[in-house]
């Protein structure tokens, strides 16, 4: 399906509004430090050019690829070398190497200030004064901080952002209406970004076979009534969509995602009974709804898997004829029967099944060799079940903050070389698994917990790749995507680690602590806890709990004092001395 002008094709398919939004997202994700105005200028230039191509597809340069057009435009930025350093060298390359070069320079942890939320009246005024600029600014600010954000989904977030302001800026109590909506968008946005980052890591680090396996398992859980051929078609299309978005081909990605939504809604009967509600919605909402749709009910009469995959004498013949298709069918059949398993567990089972067939199909008596293959699954299933059971027990015992602290101690002991801000961020997010998953019924706990942990641990892997400091982290992150979480779970205390020297400055606190929000206070205390474990990695949990209780009491006391700063100056050194004695 070739077009004389790719840019004209995408402009016509997507429409001007989505075209401009996606180009802005693409540019912001590549050049994360550029000012907003610069990006708007580039987007307007590209849009004007696209319109000339729509008018005449044979016009000059209209036949160029989108990478060539966009790359040429990015390379016109005057301050490229000063702002981005070696990224400027990408501009000396030809396509497709130039785009690959830009992709490699995407920064998962850009040095950008945290977004501060202005007063509600200030935001409403800005929204009313120039709605278009206000929404573009949202796309820009999110995209530059989240360079792998799923672009068509970001357009959906922007539409919700717009709707929130349109509604709440008219409300009697603007803040009461708007702030919860903005909090929800922020939290959902961070979660969406992290989930997409795992998809991109899966494609880029482990290849499309890994992503397709993930998609087969997930879609088979969602659509257990669909035939294998139908699931395979959806997997192929979904893989194309995510490959494009992760590769920076945002216009193609959004266009293909719209096509996939259209296909799913036209073929609901052979996919799932749960799609109907989604399919009545407008495009962005429809695609989001389809992606989040609940699992359909399992067919009532599914036969045992053993007949085709263990008892049959043709297992090795069927496997040899088309290995990936046979394994794909096994994964599909297992996943549609097990919505109670995490996708990662299902992939481990498929991997174990594959390893058994590789070994047994070369043996003297293959059937005898693989007869007990399903028994070998038991420990693989029990491991995440135990993990969820134990950690939910601890979460219920401690509550979220103290559960996060337990994870901070656990992960600092495992990988003490990792930077303190990364350990705090990752452990706080790991700790959120409790509130998110532990309240769910038993059948939903494992898929919720383990698949969420995979997303959070991917963030650790992505940050660590930028600045590698631990061989253990590198090993867990790179050896196997599906075994990342069990690899981290199995890590023991790092005996080779040389404890960090005591630095009084790290444990010096001031009166400004008292004016911090509850979340900021927690982060300060958790930062100190990580530093404490790095200084005393063999401290027991009871010792650390005692120190943290004393710390909370010390801060509370000084924040209640008349002269807060004097209290911190006097009580701080006493607290540090008492803590050192307790941990000696």
């Amino acid at each position: 399906d070739t077009h004389k002008s790719e840019v004209a094709h995408r402009f016509k398919d997507l429409g001007e509004e989505h075209f401009k939004g996606l180009v802005l997202v693409a540019f912001s994700q590549y050049l994360q430090q550029c000012p907003f105005e610069e990006h708007v200028k580039l987007v307007n230039e590209v849009t004007e050019f696209a319109k000339t191509c729509v008018a005449d597809e044979s016009a000059e340069n209209c036949d160029k690829s989108l990478h060539t057009l966009f790359g040429d435009k990015l390379c016109t930025v005057a301050t490229l070398r000063e702002t981005y350093g070696e990224m400027a060298d990408c501009c000396a390359k030809q396509e497709p190497e130039r785009n690959e070069c830009f992709l490699q320079h995407k920064d998962d942890n850009p040095n950008l200030p945290p977004l501060v939320r202005p007063e509600v009246d200030v935001m409403c005024t800005a929204f009313h004064d120039n709605e278009a600029t206000f929404l573009k600014k949202y796309l820009y600010e999110v995209a530059r901080r989240h360079p792998y954000f799923y672009a068509p989904e970001l357009l959906f977030f922007a539409a919700r952002y717009k709707a929130a302001f349109a509604e709440c800026c008219q409300a009697a109590d603007k803040a009461a209406c708007l702030l919860p909506k903005l909090d929800e968008l922020r939290d959902e946005g961070k979660a969406s970004s992290a989930k997409q980052r795992l998809k991109c890591a899966s494609l880029q680090k482990f290849g499309d076979r890994a992503f397709k396996a993930w998609a087969v398992a997930r879609l088979s859980q969602k659509f257990p009534k669909a035939e294998f051929a139908e699931v395979s078609k959806l997997v192929t299309d979904l893989t194309k969509v995510h490959t494009e978005c992760c590769h920076g081909d945002l216009l193609e990605c959004a266009d293909d995602r719209a096509d996939l939504a259209k296909y799913m809604c036209e073929n609901q009967d052979s996919i799932s009974s749960k799609l109907k509600e989604c399919c009545d919605k407008p495009l962005l909402e429809k695609s989001h709804c389809l992606a989040e749709v609940e699992n359909d009910e399992m067919p009532a009469d599914l036969p045992s898997l053993a007949a085709d995959y263990v008892e049959s004498k043709d297992v090795c013949k069927n496997y040899a004829e088309a290995k990936d298709v046979f394994l794909g069918m096994f994964l599909y059949e297992y996943a549609r029967r097990h919505p109670d398993y995490s996708v990662m567990l299902l992939l481990r089972l498929a991997k174990a099944y594959e390893a058994t067939l590789e070994k047994c199909c070369a043996a003297a008596d293959p059937h005898e060799c693989y007869a007990k293959v399903f028994d070998e699954f038991q420990p693989l299933v029990e491991e995440p079940q135990n993990l969820v059971k134990q950690n939910c027990e601890l979460f219920e015992q401690l509550g979220e903050y103290k559960f996060q602290n337990a994870l901070l101690v656990r992960y600092t002991k495992k990988v003490p070389q990792v930077s303190t801000p990364t350990l705090v961020e990752v452990s706080r997010n790991l700790g959120k698994v409790g509130a998110k998953c532990c309240k769910l019924p038993e059948a939903k706990r494992m898929p919720c917990a383990e698949d969420y942990l995979s997303v959070v641990l991917n963030r650790l892997c992505v940050l660590h790749e930028k600045t590698p400091v631990s061989e253990k982290v590198t090993k867990c992150c790179t050896e196997s995507l599906v075994n990342r979480r069990p690899c981290f779970s199995a890590l023991e205390l790092d005996e080779a680690y040389v404890p960090k020297a005591f630095n009084a400055e790290t444990f010096t606190f001031h009166a400004d602590m008292c004016t911090l929000s509850e979340k900021e206070k927690q982060v300060k205390k958790q930062t100190a806890l990580v530093e404490l474990v790095k200084h005393k990695p063999k401290a027991t949990k009871e010792q650390l709990k005692g120190v943290m209780d004393n710390f909370a009491a010390f801060v509370e006391k000084c924040c209640k004092a008349d002269d807060k700063e004097a209290c911190f100056a006097e009580e701080g050194p006493k607290f540090v001395a008492a803590s050192q004695a307790a941990l000696a």
Partner: nanobody, 124 residues
């Protein structure tokens, strides 16, 4: 401080049985989970089994499942490891450990207190 003392180790033939005990003194034993770990000669210490504070959840290493049983008697401040169908590869120093969370984790660093160990040798 919790003090833990293991007993019951010794020399046993393959296929035989042993019962290890772990006597605790100090704070209330019933608030701690208990774990058994072992260190085979020339190898790392490894998880064997654990039991939570109330005794209603038990966990086992795959290598001992079906052969070993962990239990506890909170009234006696004692934990037990019943080992049967012993194999030469079970030869190790066995350690008892207490976990203040009361959960019974698989990782050794989660345990706050440790006994000195008791030798188990399985040989004909």
């Amino acid at each position: 401080q919790v003090q833990l003392v293991e007993s019951g180790g010794g020399l046993v033939q393959p296929g035989g049985s042993l019962r290890l005990s772990c006597a605790a003194s100090g704070p209330i034993f019933s608030t701690y989970a208990m774990g058994w770990f072992r260190q085979p000669p020339g190898k790392e210490r490894e998880f064997v089994a654990s039991i939570n504070r109330s005794g209603d959840s038990t966990y086992y290493a795959d290598s001992v499942k079906g052969r070993f049983t962990i239990s506890r008697d909170n009234a006696k401040n004692t934990g037990y490891l019943q080992m049967s169908s012993l194999k030469p590869e079970d030869t190790a120093v066995y350690y008892c450990a207490a976990d203040s969370d009361g959960i019974g984790w698989f990782n050794s660093f989660e345990y706050d207190y440790w006994g000195r160990g008791t030798q188990v040798t399985v040989s004909s």
